[in-house]
């Protein structure tokens, strides 16, 4: 699959699964075309990650068409932001991070604002809404979850997100983009160098981007467990 995938060309707005080292294939959208004049991003697309609302530059070999690949890569997993991303790519594919400013390269054409009346029961799955708000979250990502923690860790879901856990920092979710988030979540590290320097701020309370590979082996288990406790996409037992 990857061989034919290398030849694939994408256009703005295309939905894909994007692969970064240490990350699962992540639901994403092509936001900008390659700019040949800029050496560092030549032949690389700017990709917007659903769920985390972060961006990165990736080459076509790391991009996989969404519709063709969703059976293979579209299984929910416990990475922070991943399952929210699966929901967004299906239900809200034009979502933009708050404070999002596209650079003046070959970016996607702005779509007109939709009519305010959506279909009954909010049944219109594909809309053209563009978010707009003042908040800008800090860019942080989480560590990879280790396979040994897979079983028994999938315990947090909507309605069970605020379980009391000594390992969950009280301010793990910080919508105002303050510095304390970086201090609180020390296990989280910035995205790899390929990520755009002025990349899109993640949304308040969002899961973090596709996680980077672990750097310190001895802390793996403890940190993965901590991550599980913090992750909005991981369900826990009802405490009430």
């Amino acid at each position: 699959m990857s061989r034919s995938n290398r030849q694939k060309e994408y256009k703005c707005g295309d939905l894909v699964f994007a692969k970064m080292k240490g990350y699962p294939h992540w639901p994403a959208r092509i936001d900008e075309m390659p700019e040949a004049a800029v050496k560092s991003t030549a032949n690389k697309y700017q990709v917007f990650f659903f769920g985390t609302h972060e961006t990165a530059f990736l080459g076509p070999k790391d991009l996989f068409p969404y519709e063709e690949s969703k059976e293979k890569f579209g299984k929910p997993n416990k990475r922070k932001g991943f399952s929210e991303g699966l929901w967004e790519i299906e239900n809200n594919p034009t979502v933009k991070a708050s404070g999002y400013q596209s650079s003046q390269k070959k970016s996607c054409v702005e779509e007109p604002e939709p009519e305010p009346e959506a279909a009954e029961g909010d049944g219109d799955k594909k809309g053209n809404a563009e978010g707009s708000s003042d908040e800008e979250g800090k860019l942080v990502i989480d560590e990879p979850a280790k396979e040994k923690n897979e079983k028994g860790a999938l315990k947090r879901r909507a309605g069970d997100l605020l379980e009391d856990s000594p390992k969950r920092p009280k301010e793990a979710e910080n919508p105002e983009g303050e510095e304390k988030e970086a201090a609180t979540l020390e296990v989280e590290r910035p995205l790899p160098m390929e990520v755009e320097k002025n990349s899109t701020p993640s949304e308040p309370g969002s899961g973090r981007g596709p996680p980077q590979e672990e750097e310190e082996e001895e802390d793996e288990e403890e940190e993965a467990t901590k991550e599980d406790a913090e992750a909005p996409g991981i369900r826990d037992h009802e405490s009430l």
Partner: antibody, heavy 120, light 106 residues
């Protein structure tokens, strides 16, 4: 296209048991991450969440109504059933079912609602 | 239980006005907050999820913000079709809605 539709009696007597059915299309309750919730709204009042059932049969109930509620699903029929015992006139409301995703998103798809009146 | 308190309970504003509706949770809900719009005789519609993300098809004049226990929904320029009742909803511990804010034209 995701659609949900509630059905059941429009009138029940006090002390009786209400049984409501939510029939949906466009998704499956056998799909990982999917849930269906029931929410009600008395005339002129606020929304009140009642119960949620997940694809894996993990259920949640409103604590103040838990003893009266049961939520079940029939995956093959694409249906979720809510039963509410010992109905009282204060339970008169429009009852909605809605689809929910396992993770951090809202009730994105709702049925049109069905008005249930409790009266003798 | 987590209680959600909206203010004001009703609000009159002129077309073109900037309108803000507040929602306070009885405990920190870590941004697990949604906003819904409901028009008479209709089911609610999801407007904003995860504190500030606009749902599909929602005009960009709507925005959400907040943290901890305090959240708000803002309409930057009120339009006739925005007349409705707005509900906040937390989903951190089970699900609870605010009592609603009825928005009317002045």
């Amino acid at each position: 296209q995701i659609t949900l539709k509630e059905s059941g009696p429009t009138l029940v007597k006090p002390t009786q048991t209400l049984t409501l059915t939510c029939t949906f299309s466009g998704f499956s309750l056998s799909t990982s991450g999917i849930g269906v919730a029931w929410i009600r709204q008395p005339p002129g009042k606020a929304l009140e969440w009642l119960a949620t059932i997940w694809w894996d049969d993990d259920n949640r109930y409103n604590p103040s109504l838990k003893s009266r509620l049961t939520i079940t699903k029939d995956t093959s029929k694409n249906q979720v059933v809510l039963t509410m015992t010992n109905m009282d006139p204060v339970d008169t409301a429009t009852y909605y079912c809605a689809q929910i995703y396992d993770y951090a998103v809202g009730f994105a798809y709702w049925g049109q609602g069905t008005l249930v009146t409790v009266s003798s | 239980d987590i209680q959600m308190t909206q203010s004001p309970s009703s609000l009159s504003a002129s077309l073109g006005d900037r309108v803000t509706i507040s929602c306070r949770a009885s405990q920190d809900i870590s941004n697990y907050l949604n906003w819904y719009q409901q028009k008479p005789g209709k089911a609610p519609k999801l407007l904003i999820y995860y504190t500030s993300r606009l749902h599909s098809g929602v005009p960009s004049r709507f925005s959400g913000s907040g943290s901890g226990t305090d959240y708000s929904l803002t309409i930057s320029s009120l339009q006739p079709e925005d007349i409705a009742t707005y509900y906040c909803q937390q989903y951190g511990k089970l699900w609870t809605f605010g009592q609603g804010t009825k928005l009317e034209i002045k």
